[in-house]
């Protein structure tokens, strides 16, 4: 069944004399492998012989016989799939029909392929997009229905005969669907390319010309314009006339409308190719161009900058920055409309001309207080001198200056007084808004910059104030010099360094911590009696009678201060010892008799010893010697001895008389 043979290959192949043909081909024979293959040139079926007649270009049989033509024609296929053929070189007379006679064990098939061989290399074909617009990227395609492995070729692009700089992308196809060589060129045409000739040139491997195709570019573009101005430099003075002419150098398609623009805005009622400006004013200075439109869009000429020259206008001053802090940098800028630009500037401060600066900008690196004020300027160019416009104010700010703390009170200030201080300053910008005081205290501020200290302390030494605007300036501290009575008056023993013993030399000092004023007087007192007026109280030989409570007083012009009472203690051995008897020195036997050792001692007696008339010490050591019951034998003279840490003392003899009781007398 012949319908079972399926072939795929290009319908027609193109080549030229001396080139080659590569015929990509696939087939499918469903009843088994190919046993015989014959390539005919222009085959014709012979009904009589039931065979095909024609030139056999290639023959492959079981016996393997191959005609001599086989060297030029090659079957590159196989027995079941591939039927690719190559003819190299190909000749003009190879044109026509190629017949592939295929035979399998049971089936036969004739497949026809058209071959078109030209005498000379045929030209490629340039394909262009339907419309080309300036600056829009397009792809130019050059297509040649030829490709063969044995015959390399190249396609080159030329613009007006000159190779194009843009890189082309060449691709080849040798498939059962198509055989071609293609070159694609991406290209952004400009308006100047309109009407230019583009060529695609076919060359052999050595670059030898084979054939070409040419097209003329039709680049759609907005009108291209040239503007001409009289005078040519476009510099005029007020009152002069100016003519501008617009010329169209190219337009595709043809232009339709004309207009004129100044600084990008259309001028009304100006729709011709000539613009006449009569008696120009400075307001007519600006950038002029003409605009011509076509179907693509509007085209604009280059701008002509028309300069209408005039003397400077009244100037204004810009200050960067005001207010300015003293010591900071400031820049003054003189702004004045003028053409040509001013060449010289005169600066004014508070209406007076300032020398030394003739520039548009004046830069002061570190501003000073006298720079404050109103600044104005005058600009000058070749056409004249402008007028002084309104001034700009420079405000120079600084901390309060020459701040002083002032005591409002009459001097001297005494402890306990109410003191009023004021904080004064010389100048300030901005104004002082608050004050600070050192040291801090629970003090009153009855009004801004005034401090009231109620009941001023003796130790309030110095006060400083600060006047503050955006910054605080501190005054030097002011001494209050508060006067007060002597403080911390106390009695201090200078000598002896240890405890005072009777007979010692003793010095007491009247001390105080401070006094203002410094001049003081001293007073010593004992039990309300004035003892001395020196800072020291001296005893050459102290006696127990000097012991007691001492006070010293220190006074100055403000007042007097007493010390705490200070007890003077004199240590001495027991003295003035005597033995006292109770109930008396005559006691009846049987009764009770108490002998007491009385003494004066400092420190008190710590140890007592009793003696009888024989100077025999008795075994008693307390202050009291109790005899109970008393006997007549107890009669006699007694004495005692007292001992303390300082020494010993003894009493004189005291006689105890014990008399008989009536009972004893009665018994006798």
């Amino acid at each position: 069944d012949s319908s079972k043979w399926v072939f795929e290959h290009p319908e027609t192949l193109y080549a030229w004399e001396g080139a080659c043909v590569w015929i990509p081909c696939t087939y499918r024979a469903l009843d088994g492998d190919l046993e015989s293959f014959i390539l005919f040139h222009n085959p014709e079926y012979n009904k009589n012989t039931s065979k095909f007649d024609g030139t056999r270009l290639y023959e492959s049989t079981k016996d393997g016989k191959v005609p001599s033509e086989q060297k030029r024609v090659q079957f590159l296929g196989d027995k079941n799939k591939n039927c690719t053929l190559s003819i190299h070189p190909v000749h003009l007379n190879d044109s026509g029909q190629l017949g592939l006679r295929m035979e399998s064990k049971t089936e036969k098939w004739m497949e026809r392929i058209h071959l078109n061989v030209s005498e000379r290399p045929f030209p490629p074909h340039i394909q262009l997009p339907p419309e080309i617009q300036e600056s829009q990227e397009v792809t130019l395609t050059c297509l040649l229905n030829f490709s063969c492995y044995g015959y390399p070729i190249q396609l080159q692009w030329l613009l007006e005969g000159v190779p194009m700089r843009q890189a082309a992308v060449t691709s080849t196809s040798l498939t059962i669907k198509s055989v071609f060589t293609r070159s694609e060129l991406k290209f952004s045409p400009q308006w100047s390319h309109h009407g230019k000739i583009v060529t695609c040139q076919l060359q052999d491997a050595d670059g030898k010309f084979l054939s070409n195709d040419t097209v003329q570019l039709n680049v759609k573009h907005t009108p291209k314009l040239e503007i001409k101005v009289t005078p040519s430099d476009a510099i005029v003075r007020e009152g002069d006339s100016v003519t501008m002419t617009c010329e169209v150098s190219s337009s595709n398609p043809e232009y339709t409308t004309v207009s004129w623009l100044k600084d990008g805005t259309s001028l009304k009622k100006q729709n011709t190719f000539t613009l006449n400006l009569r008696e120009v004013t400075k307001d007519q200075s600006g950038k002029y161009c003409c605009q011509v439109s076509n179907d693509v869009g509007p085209g604009r000429s280059e701008e002509v900058f028309l300069q209408v020259q005039y003397a400077p206008e009244p100037s204004t001053v810009q200050i960067l920055h005001s207010p300015a802090v003293e010591g900071s940098q400031v820049e003054f800028l003189c702004m004045s409309l003028a053409n040509p630009l001013p060449t010289n500037y005169t600066w004014y401060h508070n209406g007076k001309e300032m020398q030394g600066r003739t520039e548009e900008k004046v830069h002061i690196p570190k501003i000073l207080p006298w720079h404050a004020g109103t600044y104005s300027c005058v600009a000058e160019n070749i056409l004249g001198t402008g007028q002084r416009g309104p001034g700009a104010e420079l405000d120079v700010q600084y901390p309060p200056k020459k701040v002083t703390t002032v005591i409002q009170n009459p001097m001297p200030i005494r402890e306990g007084d109410t003191v009023t201080l004021s904080c004064n300053y010389n100048s300030s910008n901005p104004s002082v808004t608050r004050y600070e005081w050192k040291p801090h205290g629970a003090w009153e501020e009855p009004s801004l910059g005034v401090l009231k200290i109620q009941n001023v302390g003796w130790d309030n030494t110095t006060i400083a104030c600060a006047a503050c605007n955006s910054w605080c300036s501190w005054a030097s501290p002011v001494a209050l010099n508060v006067q007060y009575a002597p403080r911390d008056v106390r009695v201090r023993k200078i000598k002896p360094l240890s405890e005072i013993h009777s007979g010692n030399s003793v010095s007491l000092q009247c001390d105080f911590s401070s006094s203002h004023p410094k001049e003081v007087q001293f007073f010593w007192e004992k039990n309300g009696r004035l003892l001395g007026k020196e800072s020291q109280l001296n005893f050459d030989s102290i006696s127990p009678e000097d012991a007691g409570s001492y006070s010293c007083w220190v006074n100055n012009s403000i007042g007097q201060t007493a010390s705490k009472a200070w007890t003077l203690e004199v240590l001495y051995a027991p003295r003035r010892l005597r033995v006292s008897m109770s109930p008396g020195d005559q006691v009846m036997e049987g009764k009770s008799a108490t002998l007491t050792c009385e003494s004066d001692a400092n420190p008190p007696v710590s140890h007592y010893t009793w003696f009888d008339w024989n100077n025999q010490s008795l075994p008693y050591h307390s202050q009291k010697l109790r005899l109970e019951p008393v006997k007549v034998q107890h009669s006699g003279a007694y004495w005692c001895q007292g001992t303390n840490s300082v020494g010993k003392g003894r009493s004189p003899l005291s006689t105890l008389t014990v008399y008989y009781s009536p009972e004893t007398i009665g018994r006798r």
């Epitope: 508070n350 007076k352 001309e353 020398q355 002061i364 690196p365 006298w370 200056k401 300036s473």
Partner: antibody
Amino acid sequence: EVQLVESGGGLVKPGGSLRLSCAASGFTFSDYYMSWIRQAPGKGLEWVSYISSSGSTIYYADSVKGRFTISRDNAKNSLYLQMNSLRAEDTAVYYCARDDFWSGSVDYWGQGTLVTV
Amino acid sequence: SYVLTQPPSVSVAPGKTATITCGGTNIGSKNVHWYQQKPGQAPVLAIYYDSDRPSGIPERFSGSNSGNTATLTISRVEAGDEADYFCQVWDSSSDHWVFGGGTKLTVL
């Protein structure tokens, strides 16, 4: 050419008075701030007083405040320094000086006049 | 009040560089001007605005000012540069001009 010429110096007893003058030429006197600066023999420079172009702003050194008075007569292109209650320590060469408004520097100095107290 | 401290004297060989300092608290925030005074003559402005040169002053004279020190530098010193040099600032706290004590430049 800028010129500043001082006059009025001389010998004076302590407590006495002197008036120094400075004649300015070669520039627009009324546009400039002016100063008096002194130099005691063998010593450094000491600023004395300063006056703005219109005379509205005046500064004095603490050492002369209350005793010296600076003034100017723009019509006569003249600067003055009235010195009262003169002291031995006021003995110096007194320079008349032109101030540059912008920088505050002294751009021109006179040759000075000697005051001996 | 504001105090400017200058070294009493500076000595330099001809052709070398002389550096004269002027010390003051935060002097960098103030305009410093320098004056040259030759014996028996009035002072002459040498540098203003810290580092600007008036016309007529050679390029060898330069100034700088930052922190607590302003400096006058004289490069390639010549015999004719021998003079007293004074620095000057405006003390804004007291509204006074203040001069340094002066530096005697000796060219060896």
